[in-house]
């Protein structure tokens, strides 16, 4: 057993059928000494007396809000979370195994640019009785400073017949460098509780692999004179990390027709400006990735040829 | 990336050339280090990621653009110069400040370059000839230091007497590799940064 | 005590269908996962498909995936394959077993999938 | 595809040593614990080994299991008759949990 914060303790439990469970002794925070009895959350029956409860936590029953109470006064509450060991394995039933870039993935994140600020997202179904609480450090062994805001509700889809939420979270290194070299990685940590079950998840990157730039901005097309060749201009996003010239990004240019089947004439180029051939309802699309480092490409900005 | 990409005339700044085959150099070998040795520990999540030039030269400080040293996060480790205009060509006068950027990206491919060639003996004697270092990273790292025109005293090769232990040295080979192809990307982003300048 | 009960198993043609039940009793069924693993005759444990507690998640082997579909109808307090387009290679003994550092198995049911 | 790779057959005699391995990688037995069964003719699995080295109450004391890297073991201290059957290592990979990644099983033959 662990305090997560005052007054709300974590029994882990090694769960499978008929498991022994956990014995906990729960302290009345009173000086009083006498006359002191037990409650469970909104039962008026009473567990035990005295300054100490011992009780034997196996499932979710036994968990809940502990109130002690004298004369019909409430001394103090103690609130126990149960977190689910299966089989050596933290239980993950709160978060949604988003599957993406690999299996196991509930947290995900991504950075704009190098200036330590980043982003991480996940996933559920459940809709009530849930809180989210976020950590993180650049290292574990000796842990640099990362702040983190509160998670707060930033979508909902329907997926099938089950509607899912999004929650996320901004985060921004203490001190960071956008020139510096990564050696130890960024630790979030994300602390889940729904109804009376706790679970924690955490992630580990370097902010150069969360890279992804926000799309080129100022997309414009010039016509070339005599010529079914147009002139692509693109500016770099606002938000990329300066100077561009060290901070330098690549370009892919891409010509779709209104059908997908149709052929995708693509260019790669390192400047803001590409010649393509524009072909009639076709539209053009320009997205960045850092020339150096390649994380992930930006999403498309594009244009109709018309 | 799928297409080539056209680099700059290499006679007007051979650094930004030689950096950008660097790169590609290092990249390749990681991959084919990743893929070959996949029962390793040898992506980023499962290595320790160690620096060999840490507190031997500084890179970073010494080359930082002038825009950031501003940022006193970037200044919190050194008294740190920074580049100001110049080139990589003898030609040009080149400034005190990016003198020491230079001749600390020297120094780093140098001892880089110690490291792989001893690597490489080790590897060369394991009977399992799983993998050696590719021959063009190797001399790829030998066109920058030449460009770069930089004397200084010859590091020895590390010879070592005892009988290498190949899964050690294996695992040691992926920690150089991801480190090293962190330290191109920095190399690579100053030769831009001056070839703009 | 912890007891699990297994029920549906025969013999069936190719392409056909059968439901294999899993009745457990002497623990809070609807708090704990549930696997089902087969055994081949003269093989080795294969792992088969997993659900979790409350029948959000279910896992499966890429052999009967799209074929097999595991569920649970925790009022009572029972497991169920549901096996479709049935293969001579299905052809096994077939375990319920509860999920955790400690489990148990069911008793056992043949499968014979035979023309 | 059975992934954790044990020997086909041992044997001993009744009162030796005999050891069984399983052999993973990186992904299952080295990120994950492991367990191991004892499988009598025509009956259900039943646990021997949790935790990579637990053994659940009633199991004699002459089962112990031990993991080192990728490779976990079962020995088998003073061997006896009834102990004569198959035996199955079993883990979780960290991509696919919780699907269960089996032995391909090692069959204990009591000599004498």
């Known amino acids: 057993i662990w305090e997560l914060k005052k007054d709300v303790y974590v029994v882990e439990l090694d769960w499978y059928p008929d498991a022994p469970g956990e014995m906990v002794v729960l302290t009345c925070d009173t000086p009083e000494e006498d006359g002191i009895t037990w409650t469970l959350d909104q039962s008026s029956e009473v567990l035990g007396s005295g300054k100490t409860l011992t009780i034997q936590v196996k499932e979710f029953g036994d968990a809940g809000q502990y109130t002690c109470h004298k004369g019909g006064e409430v001394l103090s509450h103690s609130l126990l979370l149960l977190h689910k060991k299966e089989d050596g394995i933290w239980s993950t039933d709160i978060l949604k195994d988003q599957k993406e870039p690999k299996n196991k993935t509930f947290l995900r994140c991504e950075a704009k640019n190098y200036s330590g600020r980043f982003t991480c997202w996940w996933l559920t179904t459940i809709s009530t009785d849930l809180t989210f609480s976020v950590k993180s450090s650049r290292g574990s062994s000796d842990p640099q400073g990362v702040t983190c805001g509160a998670a707060t509700l930033s979508a909902e889809r329907v997926r099938g017949d089950n509607k899912e939420y999004e929650y996320s979270v901004e985060c921004q290194e203490d001190s960071a460098c956008p020139a510096a070299e990564e050696s130890l990685p960024i630790e979030v940590m994300v602390d889940a509780v729904h109804k009376l079950k706790y679970e924690n998840y955490t992630s580990s990157f370097f902010i150069r692999d969360i890279i992804k730039p926000d799309p080129p901005k100022n997309l414009q097309l010039k016509p070339l004179k005599n010529s079914r060749q147009v002139e692509v201009s693109w500016e770099y996003p606002d938000t990329w990390s300066t100077p561009h010239s060290y901070f330098s990004l690549t370009f892919c240019v891409q010509v779709q027709g209104k059908s997908k089947r149709e052929k995708k004439d693509r260019v790669f180029t390192d400047k803001t400006s590409a010649t393509v051939i524009c072909r009639k309802n076709a539209s053009i699309s320009v997205r960045a990735q850092d020339r150096y480092y390649s994380s992930s490409w930006s999403e498309w900005a594009s244009v109709p040829c018309s | 990336r799928n297409l080539p990409v056209a680099t700059p005339d290499p006679g007007m700044f051979p650094c930004l050339h030689h950096s950008q085959n660097l790169l590609r150099a290092v990249s390749n070998m990681l991959q084919k280090a990743r893929q070959t040795l996949e029962f390793y520990p040898c992506t980023s999540e499962e290595i320790d990621h160690e620096d060999i030039t840490k507190d031997k030269t500084s890179t970073v400080e010494a080359c930082l653009p002038l825009e950031l040293t501003k940022n006193e996060s970037c200044l919190n480790s050194r008294e740190t110069s920074f580049i100001t205009n110049g080139s990589c060509l003898a030609s040009r006068k080149t400034s005190f400040m990016m003198a020491l950027c230079l001749s600390s990206i020297y120094e780093d491919l140098k001892m880089y370059q110690v490291e792989f060639k001893t690597m490489n003996a080790k590897l060369l004697m394991d009977p399992k000839r799983q993998i050696f270092l590719d021959q063009n990273m190797l001399a790829v790292i030998d066109e920058l230091m030449q460009a770069l025109n930089f004397n200084s005293e010859t590091v020895p090769q590390k010879s070592s007497l005892e009988e290498p232990d190949f899964y050690k040295t294996k695992i040691k080979l992926c920690i150089l590799l991801h480190a090293f192809r962190i330290r191109a990307v920095t190399i690579d982003r100053v030769m831009s940064y001056l070839n703009a300048s | 005590q912890v007891q699990l009960v297994q029920s549906g198993g025969g013999v069936v043609q190719p392409g056909r269908s059968l439901r294999l039940s899993c009745a457990a009793s002497?623990?809070?069924?609807?708090?704990?996962?549930m696997h089902w693993v087969r055994q081949a005759p003269g093989k080795g444990l294969e792992w088969v498909a997993f659900i979790r507690y409350d029948g959000s998640n279910k896992y499966y082997a890429d052999s009967v995936k799209g074929r097999f579909t595991i569920s649970r109808d925790n009022s009572k307090n029972t497991l169920y394959l549901q096996m479709k387009s049935l293969r001579a290679e299905d052809t096994a003994v077939y375990y319920c077993k509860t999920h955790g550092s400690h489990d148990n198995w069911g008793q056992g049911t043949m499968v014979t999938v035979s023309s | 595809s059975y992934v954790l790779t044990q020997p086909p057959s041992v044997s001993g005699t009744p009162g030796q040593r005999v050891t069984i391995s399983c052999s993973g990688g990186r992904s299952n037995i080295g990120s994950n614990y492991v367990k191991w069964y004892q499988q009598l003719p025509g009956t259900a699995p039943k646990l021997l080994i949790y935790?990579?080295?637990q053994r659940p109450s009633g199991v004699p004391d002459r089962f112990s299991g031990s993991k080192s890297g990728t490779s976990a073991s079962l020995a088998i201290t003073g061997v006896q008759a009834e102990d004569e059957a198959d035996y199955y290592c079993q883990s979780y990979d960290r991509g696919t949990h919780p699907a269960l990644l089996f032995g391909t099983g090692t069959k204990v033959t009591v000599l004498g």
């Open positions: 935790g990579n080295d």
């Open positions: 002497g623990f809070t069924f609807s708090s704990y996962g």
